[in-house]
């Protein structure tokens, strides 16, 4: 029988085969953020480089207006690193009535937006208190996991404070996804 | 028509199919670094275990002389974790005219070397200020992302200070890559 | 010849092809941990949500009693993030005869259990000293790498202190694996 050599030994019925090279994939890299207004209680979304340097999108995975657009349903591995940097956080030095302040923090959220669903879904969150005693500090937050996404879903990266994001190098702050 | 069951429903033309099990893959684990001199302003490269314990290379992905050699062009997921450890960083204690020192830092870079290209390319960087006040400190930096690589490319992991790398356990410090 | 379009150009012999969509995969999310006794020198294992919200298991990858069960041999990418949070660690403040205390620490270990092997194998470890000076602190540890697993292997996530794990949100603390 033709095609028999492709059949796995335990004779399960499989979904259609497809070549790996044509799967939707993207790796986006940091750019300097343009000043934009955002609501007080809403983390702003980062925008990204999608074609220069190390950045690319391929096989119908498109980047537009801070969003990665998911072109086909399936399980995706999604990842991001955001490097933050700032001057001393005063949380340990300024004490009110002898009580340490609530610490400053840095947060990254990878968010999914589905047009048919009113609320965005937080897929991944990395959050860290920052209470540094040196003069200036810098540190990355890395996230990555697998999610079942639907065609038309949109992904974005939100941060707690856009002004603390290190936009200086494409290898320090990035965002990517690929169909498994 | 024979083979029709392999054709995806939206009838796109695909690259040749290939079995996942034969794709180039490697997971390398930490070994104690041999004492070698390195240039002051250049981050030294780590060398790795490639066959004992959890470490392996397969399907033409080879490790030689601190480098992972990419045997075929394609999109690879590349990752590394380096655990650093050290005795107290003095940055918070030594103050000049009341001003905290520039903090110490730890940095990991995953670097690509292409023979036809004069300069190495930094693919991923994780960098963190270290200003610890306890007696000894330890912490990991994790990196991972997808890149389009060419046959013959070489990958290495560079660190800011080789003496701070925790080489004691294969699960603490590692480096890997696999073709998607 | 029928099926020729599936043959890769370098004419290697491949293992049987199989569709990506049927590969074993799981993404588990945090739940509040039930108080259980564990041995003093053994890190307790977390238990997980496997079907509500973002969590899922598919294609014979099953979750049972804190373990992910590996249904077929192959190379898997395994990942986890654990977000820890706690009140001030005093390690930098209490000094005995001018000597800083041993720092507190937080540790995540992804462990493999093979029934035919007496000892569990630590696949991945993320460990960090915690010596915070603010009033309360929080931070994630992320791990991810590729391992060759055998059918019947079991995976779990162990932590140094279960009471410090942030169980409040499914995007903060999670555990997953997928066959490559």
């Amino acid at each position: 029988l033709k095609g028999q050599e492709f059949a796995p030994s335990h004779q399960q019925v499989y979904a259609p085969l497809r070549a790996d090279g044509d799967k939707p994939r993207a790796h986006l890299t940091v750019v300097r953020q343009t000043p934009t207004q955002h609501f007080k209680n809403q983390f702003p979304a980062l925008h990204w480089e999608h074609e220069l340097g190390l950045a690319f999108t391929k096989n119908r995975m498109n980047y537009t207006n801070k969003f990665l657009l998911i072109p086909e349903s399936g399980d995706y591995f999604i990842y991001s690193q955001v490097t933050f940097r700032g001057m001393t956080s005063e949380c340990s030095e300024i004490r009110q009535a002898g009580r340490p302040n609530k610490p400053d923090s840095i947060t990254v959220v990878i968010t999914k937006v589905t047009d048919s669903y009113p609320e965005p879904t937080q897929l991944l969150m990395g959050t860290k208190s920052v209470c540094e005693v040196g003069s200036n500090w810098f540190q990355p937050i890395y996230l990555g996991a697998m999610f079942s996404l639907q065609e038309g879903d949109k992904l974005m990266v939100n941060v707690s404070d856009i002004s603390l994001v290190d936009y200086t190098k494409e290898d320090k702050t990035f965002f990517g996804a690929f169909l498994l | 028509l024979k083979g029709q069951e392999f054709a995806p429903s939206h009838q796109q033309v695909y690259a040749p199919l290939r079995a996942d099990g034969d794709k180039p893959r490697a997971h390398l684990t930490v070994v104690r670094q041999t004492p070698t001199q390195h240039f002051k302003n250049q981050f030294p490269a780590l060398h790795w275990e490639h066959e004992l314990g959890l470490a392996f290379t397969k399907n033409r992905m080879n490790y030689t002389n601190k480098f992972l050699l990419i045997p075929e062009s394609g999109d690879y997921f590349i990752y590394s974790q380096v655990t650093f450890r050290g005795m107290t960083s003095e940055c918070s204690e030594i103050r000049q005219a009341g001003r905290p020192n520039k903090p110490d830092s730890i940095t990991v870079v995953i670097t690509k070397v292409t023979d036809s290209y004069p300069e190495p390319t930094q693919l991923l960087m994780g960098t963190k200020s270290v200003c610890e006040v306890g007696s000894n400190w330890f912490q990991p930096i994790y990196l991972g992302a997808m890149f389009s690589l060419q046959e013959g490319d070489k990958l290495m992991v560079n660190v800011s200070d080789i003496s701070l790398v925790d080489y004691t356990k294969e699960d603490k410090t590692f480096f890997g890559a696999f073709l998607l | 010849l029928k099926g020729q379009e599936f043959a890769p150009s370098h004419q290697q012999v491949y293992a049987p092809l199989r569709a990506d969509g049927d590969k074993p995969r799981a993404h588990l999310t945090v739940v509040r941990q039930t108080p259980t006794q564990h041995f003093k020198n053994q890190f307790p294992a977390l238990h997980w949500e496997h079907e509500l919200g973002l969590a899922f298991t598919k294609n014979r990858m099953n979750y049972t009693n804190k373990f992910l069960l590996i249904p077929e041999s192959g190379d898997y990418f395994i990942y986890s993030q654990v977000t820890f949070r706690g009140m001030t660690s005093e390690c930098s403040e209490i000094r005995q005869a001018g000597r800083p205390n041993k720092p507190d620490s937080i540790t995540v270990v992804i462990t493999k259990v093979t029934d035919s092997y007496p000892e569990p194998t630590q696949l991945l470890m993320g460990t960090k000293s915690v010596c915070e000076v603010g009033s309360n602190w929080f931070q994630p540890i992320y791990l991810g790498a590729m391992f060759s697993l055998q059918e019947g292997d079991k995976l779990m996530v162990n932590v140094s202190d279960i009471s410090l794990v942030d169980y409040t949100k499914e995007d903060k603390t999670f555990f997953g694996a997928f066959l490559l």
């Epitope: - | 070994v31 104690r32 670094q33 041999t34 070698t36 005795m87 007696s135 200070d161 080789i162 701070l164 | -």
Partner: antibody, heavy 119, light 111 residues
Framework: QVQLVQSGAEVKKPGASVKVSCKAS????????INWVRQAPGQGLEWMGW????????GYAQKFQGRVTMTADRSTSTAYMELSSLRSEDTAVYYC????????????WGQGTLVTVSS | QSVLTQPPSVSGAPGQRVTISCTSS?????????VHWYQQLPGTAPKLLIE???NRPSGVPDRFSGSKSGTSASLTITGLLPEDEGDYYC??????????FGGGTKLTVLG
């Protein structure tokens, strides 16, 4: 209990080689690095290098590179240090020492082997 | 080449307190693994007294303590005993993970 027992004293001629052994007992030999340290008569301690008995990996002090070889026989839990092209200034007591993995301090020491280089 | 410098000799009467210093010529000495201290009594192999600046292995009396300040480490012996007489060495690692020993300090217990 942990013990490191070294081979006996040796007398060698200049230009020759010497191989000193260090037999370990009381612990899992492959789990700890072994270091070699020497001490010339009336002098201080001088580090020569380390050996990982599990992998066979080594790291040598720059001064001894090309002249020293450290090896292990896992079946007998024995570490070896061979020094070639001996000269009179290599006359010393040679110690093997087991490391603490976390700090790389030398926790357990052999009794020492006197190597005399004389024509 | 990095160097660890110790005083060639120190002395004290029984019951007294002595301190031996170990100063590094480079800031990267001890940054990773700290400074360790060894005691070598006449005719014997060295013995680990202090690891990582401060920590006493089990069996080492609490008369021995270690400390650190800037690029220096110190070993302090309180309640000196005649059997403490011998040589004391500090040891650390440089930036290439090569081990370094100080030149050693001869401790004499007077009287």
């Amino acid at each position: 209990q942990v013990q490191l027992v070294q081979s006996g004293a040796e007398v060698k001629k200049p230009g020759a080689s010497v191989k000193v052994s260090c037999k370990a007992s009381g612990y899992t030999f492959t789990s700890y690095d072994i270091n070699w340290v020497r001490q010339a008569p009336g002098q201080g301690l001088e580090w020569m290098g380390w050996l990982n008995p599990n992998s066979g990996n080594t790291g040598y002090a720059q001064k001894f590179q090309g002249r020293v070889t450290m090896t292990a026989d896992r079946s007998t839990s024995t570490a070896y240090m061979e020094l070639s092209s001996l000269r009179s200034e290599d006359t010393a007591v040679y110690y093997c020492a087991r490391e603490v993995p976390e700090t790389a301090a030398f926790e357990y020491w052999g009794q020492g082997t006197l190597v005399t280089v004389s024509s | 080449q990095s160097v660890l410098t110790q005083p060639p000799s120190v002395s004290g009467a029984p019951g007294q307190r002595v301190t031996i210093s170990c100063t590094s010529s480079s800031s990267d000495i001890g940054a990773a693994l700290g400074v360790h201290w060894y005691q070598q009594l006449p005719g014997t192999a060295p013995k680990l007294l202090i690891e990582g600046y401060y920590n006493r292995p089990s069996g080492v009396p609490d008369r021995f303590s270690g400390s650190k300040s800037g690029t220096s480490a110190s070993l302090t012996i309180t309640g000196l005993l005649p059997e403490d007489e011998g040589d004391y060495y500090c040891q650390s690692y440089d930036g290439t993970l090569s081990a370094l020993f100080g030149g050693g300090t001869k401790l004499t217990v007077l009287g």
